[in-house]
């Protein structure tokens, strides 16, 4: 059967490409080490926003968190342009050590398998998508209750790498990188008016770090 042979052949090629990519690959080293800054492009698709707790000053958000970067070590040549891989491959390559600065609790979904997608393009571009639920702090000023409005932030960045090593850029520029699903609001006492995004630099004793920010604007109903 020609089709069967072709499929077997593709699997063999696929395996060979993966083996070759990982041969001598050190996942402790970031792409471009000693040569250039690693740029991580990010965007967020919010599948559900809320509920918001006034008493705990926190909110819950479900997102598809997408990160893209280039790793020249993972360039390949083959009959396919893209290698679609499961979450197991993610532990074998360098991935950004992104964390949520104002996250109280973050859960990466694991049913029925870790909800992660990894794609490698032949030019070494990686797309890493994961489904997360984040419980995040939302500082609130309740003096104007019941006419109050709040801006709940979601802040993320690299845990260990300074701005001179790893920097984050909004994939779709500052205008369009955080989308909320049309049916995404899980709020009963607030209206989600919209969101704005930006970028900050924070200084600490260990250096300067890039912090990406998304603010979700709420107004009490």
């Amino acid at each position: 059967n020609i089709q069967e042979d072709e499929a077997k052949n593709n699997i063999t090629i696929f395996t060979r490409i993966l083996d070759r990519l990982l041969d001598g690959y050190d996942n402790r080293l970031r792409p471009g080490l000693g040569d250039s800054i690693t740029e991580v492009f990010t965007n967020i698709y919010v599948t559900s926003f809320g509920p918001v707790s006034d008493t705990d000053m926190e909110y819950t958000i479900d997102v598809f968190f997408r990160q893209k970067w280039k790793d020249e070590r993972l360039k390949f040549k083959g009959p396919m342009n893209i290698l679609r891989l499961n979450n197991l491959m993610a532990s074998k390559i360098w991935t950004p050590d992104t964390f949520f600065h104002n996250g109280k609790k973050s859960v990466a979904h694991n049913m029925t398998m870790p909800n992660k997608l990894l794609r490698i393009q032949d030019d070494g571009t990686l797309l890493y998508t994961m489904r997360l639920t984040v419980q995040a702090e939302c500082p609130m000023h309740l003096e104007d209750f019941p006419m109050d409005a709040h801006s709940c932030p979601l802040k993320f960045g690299s845990y260990a790498y300074t701005t001179s090593e790893v920097t984050y850029i909004w994939t779709y520029n500052a205008s369009d990188s955080v989308q909320v699903a049309p049916d995404g609001s899980r709020l009963n006492q607030y209206d989600l008016l919209g969101q704005s995004i930006g970028k900050e630099t924070i200084k600490s004793s260990t250096g300067e770090y890039t912090v990406m920010t998304a603010h979700f604007h709420l107004k009490r109903k």
Partner: antibody, heavy 117, light 107 residues
Framework: EVQLQQSGAELVKPGASVKLSCTAS????????MYWVKQRPEQGLEWIGR????????KYDPKFQGKATITADTSSNTAYLQLSSLTSEDTAVYYC??????????WGQGTTLTVSS | DIQMTQTTSSLSASLGDRVTISCRAS??????LNWYQQKPDGTVKLLIY???RLHSGVPSRFSGSGSGTDYSLTISNLEQEDIATYFC?????????FGGGTKLEIK
């Protein structure tokens, strides 16, 4: 290699509609946004709108709202731009572009649309 | 909408020259500024993204700089193949907007 292949030139009558296509190779359109840009003869570039092929979400420049409809077919890795109620003002070159690294980083070769009776 | 202004609509230079093309935004665009090259045959290519990052495959003679509202594209050693129109584009707010273009010609 990333490539965007656009459909051929169109000559259409005023009042008609037209659907332009843009087929991507070398990447999956679900991993990016697809944009459409208009360029009238000897003029600058105008953003029409974009689609997120992963979920079909679209955004348009208000001045193209009602005139343009952007769709995508992920099975054929193709984005489409439909223009309705055509007038001579719609005579232009239409480009599709993809956004992989924070900008319109790959462009199609352009489709010339001529609206004339 | 944010207005993008390229004050020089055409520019004449000699091969080997250093050429600078400027672009001004009507408000702060936080470095979300990209540069494109459009060849006479209509082909459009990204040169620089996020103010100063060189897109893959673009020669290193191209560089970008700027901040706030003022940005520039520099070609350090002009070559014949650089004859084209250059557009800036902001991505800080929707809709993305383009400058009117600067047409580069050989003296």
């Amino acid at each position: 290699e990333v490539q965007l292949q656009q459909s051929g030139a169109e000559l259409v009558k005023p009042g008609a509609s037209v659907k332009l296509s843009c087929t991507a190779s070398g990447f999956n359109i679900k991993d990016t946004y697809m944009y459409w840009v208009k360029q009238r003869p000897e003029q600058g570039l105008e953003w029409i709108g974009r689609i997120d092929p992963a979920n079909g979400n679209t955004k348009y420049d208000p001045k193209f709202q009602g005139k343009a409809t952007i769709t995508a077919d992920t099975s054929s890795n193709t984005a489409y731009l439909q223009l309705s109620s055509l007038t001579s003002e719609d005579t232009a070159v239409y480009y599709c572009a993809s956004n992989y690294y924070g900008s319109f980083d790959y462009w199609g070769q352009g489709t010339t649309l001529t609206v004339s009776s | 909408d944010i207005q993008m202004t390229q004050t020089t609509s055409s520019l004449s230079a000699s091969l080997g020259d250093r050429v600078t093309i400027s672009c001004r935004a009507s408000q702060d665009i936080s470095n979300y500024l990209n540069w494109y090259q459009q060849k006479p045959d209509g082909t459009v290519k990204l040169l620089i993204y996020y103010t100063s990052r060189l897109h893959s495959g673009v020669p290193s003679r191209f560089s970008g700089s700027g901040s706030g509202t003022d940005y520039s594209l520099t070609i350090s050693n002009l070559e014949q193949e650089d004859i084209a129109t250059y557009f800036c584009q902001q991505g800080n707010t929707l809709p993305p907007t383009f400058g009117g273009g600067t047409k580069l010609e050989i003296k």
